[in-house]
């Protein structure tokens, strides 16, 4: 499911509950995706020794994974709500191609990988509703994404395993930073 359970105000388990505010819904959505990433990381780490590998730099050269930097205004010092929100949305849009890459990388967690991808799309929609300055959000070029995907899929097995591990780790870090920043707003 792209949305965590219990989101609906008609939820029978909690009829007394008020509907979630947009902030609560976004917070819950991020946590739902992070739970999914946790499950995927578990499979990745059990399947290979990538999680302990020190050769990450080799694979990292091929990737341009979104990262939070000081200038993005998402950290406590120099915090800027609008700049940060733009960074979070832009970063999530940039992660989409990497989440697409993950789709055929899991055996027992295939549904989980799909759920992470779909939930991220929903999260982007939630955040776009919250953002005032949508013009500042740059959408990745589909042609560039398509060639990147082809390039990643053409890597040897070891690099593909390492890429999977790096994507999950970076996406987890990005979402954790986003969660903290959104709570700070």
């Amino acid at each position: 499911a792209p949305v965590p359970p219990g989101e609906d105000s008609k939820d029978v388990a909690a009829p007394h509950r008020q509907p979630l505010t947009s902030s609560e819904r976004i917070d819950k959505q991020i946590r739902y995706i992070l739970d999914g990433i946790s499950a995927l990381r578990k499979e990745t780490c059990n399947k290979s020794n990538m999680c302990e590998s020190s050769k990450e730099a080799l694979a990292e050269n091929n990737l341009n994974l979104p990262k939070m930097a000081e200038k993005d205004g998402c950290f406590q010092s120099g915090f800027n709500e609008e700049t940060c929100l733009v960074k979070i949305i832009t970063g999530l849009l940039e992660f989409e191609v990497y989440l697409e890459y993950l789709q055929n990388r899991f055996e027992s967690s295939e549904e989980q990988a799909r759920a992470v991808q779909m939930s991220t799309k929903v999260l982007i929609q939630f955040l776009q509703k919250k953002a005032k300055n949508l013009d500042a959000i740059t959408t990745p070029d589909p042609t560039t994404n398509a060639s990147l995907l082809t390039k990643l899929q053409a890597q040897n097995q070891w690099l593909q395993d390492m890429t999977t591990h790096l994507i999950l780790r970076s996406f987890k870090e990005f979402l954790q930073s986003s969660l903290r920043a959104l709570r700070q707003m």
């Epitope: 505010t21 902030s23 609560e24 917070d27 819950k28 946590r31 992070l34 739970d35 946790s38 950290f75 406590q76 010092s77 915090f79 709500e81 903290r180 920043a181 959104l182 709570r183 700070q184 707003m185």
Partner: antibody, heavy 120, light 107 residues
Framework: DVQLVESGGGLVQPGGSRKLSCAAS????????MHWVRQAPEKGLEWVAY????????YYADTVKGRFTISRDNPKNTLFLQMTSLRSEDTAMYYC?????????????WGQGTSVTVSS | DIQMTQSPASLSASVGETVTITCRAS??????LAWYQQKQGKSPQLLVY???TLADGVPSRFSGSGSGTQYSLKINSLQPEDFGSYYC?????????FGGGTKLENK
């Protein structure tokens, strides 16, 4: 030195209202999320409400949702808790606390508390 | 909502002893956990955040550990100033619930 000073506590009748304040000093108030936490006599701590630095993010405990409103005035370095429809179970010491994002929202500074008694 | 179960509710120990307080969450809270100390008539003080990181100025005899749903606070070689109440708090899901507390008394 970071300082948080709560005020506004006192005796209130059931069904009544009260507004608590928390004056902050010694840090850039507008850069930090803030919490209200309460403690009933001889009981444990209960998280009440949270507000982000720019007031866009506001969260409440289910026990106070719809009755309490957290707000802040950044230029005046002040945090507020407007309490309405007060009940006897709201009797407690109310603390304001600073939320440190770098410390995963943990409360790194607390005020000395202000006591609220709901009784007829 | 995720519930926090803290144990024991009370604990008697002597100066020099080592004590451990545990908190169990009803779901994975991904290390989003803090520990606080509160002395009688005083405000709580932050001891540990992110489950394992000691807050500024906290003596090294305190240590936090755990992951997933199980967390603990260990105090090595108890000092007289360590007696009081201890609380864990989750920061993963909302509400940011506290554990029920542990009252640490001098034996």
């Amino acid at each position: 030195d970071v300082q948080l000073v709560e005020s506004g506590g006192g005796l209130v009748q059931p069904g009544g209202s009260r507004k608590l304040s928390c004056a902050a000093s010694g840090f850039t108030f507008s850069s930090f999320g803030m919490h209200w936490v309460r403690q009933a006599p001889e009981k444990g701590l209960e998280w009440v409400a949270y507000i982000g630095s720019g007031s866009s993010t506001v969260y409440y405990a289910d026990t106070v949702k719809g009755r309490f409103t957290i707000s802040r005035d950044n230029p005046k370095n002040t945090l507020f808790l407007q309490m309405t429809s007060l009940r006897s179970e709201d009797t407690a010491m109310y603390y304001c606390a600073r939320s440190e994002t770098a410390r995963a929202e943990a409360m790194d500074y607390w005020g000395q508390g202000t006591s609220v008694t709901v009784s007829s | 909502d995720i519930q926090m179960t803290q144990s024991p509710a009370s604990l008697s120990a002597s100066v020099g002893e080592t004590v451990t307080i545990t908190c169990r969450a009803s779901g994975n809270i991904h290390n989003y956990l803090a520990w606080y100390q509160q002395k009688q008539g005083k405000s709580p003080q932050l001891l540990v955040y992110n489950a394992k990181t000691l807050a500024d100025g906290v003596p090294s005899r305190f240590s936090g550990s755990g992951s997933g749903t199980q967390y603990s606070l260990k105090i090595n070689s108890l000092q007289p100033e360590d007696f009081g109440s201890y609380y864990c708090q989750l920061f993963w899901s909302i509400p940011w619930t506290f554990g029920g507390g542990t009252k640490l008394e001098n034996k």
